[in-house]
Amino acid sequence: KETAFVEVVLFESSPSGDYTTYTTGLTGRFSRAGATLSAEGEIVQMHPLGLCNNNDEEDLYEYGWVGVVKLEQPELDPKPCLTVLGKAKRAVQRGATAVIFDVSENPEAIDQLNQGSEDPLKRPVVYVKGADAIKLMNIVNKQKVARARIQHRPPRQPTEYFDM
């Protein structure tokens, strides 16, 4: 289980139309459910129940976004519509270039994601927990445009990313 270095950039627009960027670094782990490779895209939060819908109630996103899913406590969803791996697959089917799970409330999900799948996803499936997860979810819920870059080595220079 390799460390995933996640850099999240929050874009805030000023009244003048300029953008200010705020960069936050956090770490997670690549799970065996997906590939250990880099990915980058706009963050889209996905509700674990929303992933149950087969009939795409909302627009399908263009390919290349990073899905963020905060998993529930298992007792709140005793009969989940999909396994955690199934939710990752559903997100990738809908165009996610990577999926990040916040497993803080459901640490059992780590084992589920690491049960060596015969057919792992070709995109990275990362999990975060604790302080890193709190940081991520606070950014995701700020209602600003945010992008995530996932790497399997520490970022070198913060200036080299997100050339807009």
Partner: antibody, heavy 123, light 109 residues
């Protein structure tokens, strides 16, 4: 950015009414929800219905509103609420509100509200 | 559907004082809770989202906290302009719907 409701007024019991919400300076193509929330005189807020402004146009209703109320996006700047089989219990101020897009499968909180339009159901 | 229970229904406090409003969800909604202020004859105004994030332009005297099923709105250094009715709202899932609490009237003496 602003929202304005119209179409309220006095209606007979079992009658019908269509409310319209007109948006100014709002891009309906951006992911968001347009919703109706009502408030009976001297009472609290009650969610009625929402429509997703993206191309899917998915609609969501409070359980009590299903079958009687219909929310629609009628143009790039207007949303309507068609209300049928009205009773005195439907007497309220009806607010149009814009819901922030939180993510796929989430509901929304309301960042922008219209001033409201009063609907009175009485004979 | 989620049911939001707000307490107390009414609270009175002096200028400069502090009031605490509680909101309880019938099931866990994580941190997906908003708080609104409504004055007579006006539409509601968003104060806080994601349980504790202050909406732009809202004074830091307003503080939201909590997660899961228990949430609190605390207003400190009360001003006369804070006299209003406050509502909590869950926005957990489009499947479970949108739900408001019953409201809490804040009277400032």
């Amino acid at each position: 950015q602003s929202l304005e409701e119209s179409g309220g007024g006095l209606v007979q019991p079992e009658g019908s009414l269509t409310l319209t919400c007109t948006a100014s300076g709002i891009d309906f193509s951006a992911r968001s929800y347009m919703c109706w929330v009502r408030q009976a005189p001297g009472k609290g807020l009650e969610w009625v219905a929402c429509i997703y402004t993206g191309s899917s146009g998915s609609t969501y209703y409070a359980n009590w509103a299903k079958g009687r109320f219909t929310i629609s996006k009628t143009s790039s700047t207007t949303v309507t609420l068609r209300m049928t089989s009205l009773t005195a219990a439907d007497t309220a101020s009806y607010f149009c509100a814009r819901g922030a897009y939180v993510g796929y499968g989430f509901a929304a909180y309301f960042t922008l509200w219209g001033p409201g339009t009063l609907v009175t159901v009485s004979s | 559907d989620i049911v939001m229970t707000q307490t107390p229904a009414s609270v009175e406090a002096a200028v400069g004082g502090t009031v605490t409003i509680n909101c309880q969800a019938s099931q866990s909604i994580s941190s997906y809770l908003a708080w609104y202020q409504q004055k007579p004859g006006q539409p509601p105004k968003l104060l806080i989202y994601y349980a504790s994030n202050l909406e732009s332009g809202v004074p830091s005297r307003f503080k939201g906290s909590g997660s899961g099923t228990q949430f609190t709105l605390t207003i400190s250094d009360l001003e006369c302009a804070d006299a209003a009715t406050y509502y909590c709202q869950a926005y957990y899932s489009s499947i479970t719907g949108w739900a408001f609490g019953g409201g809490t009237e804040v009277v400032v003496k």
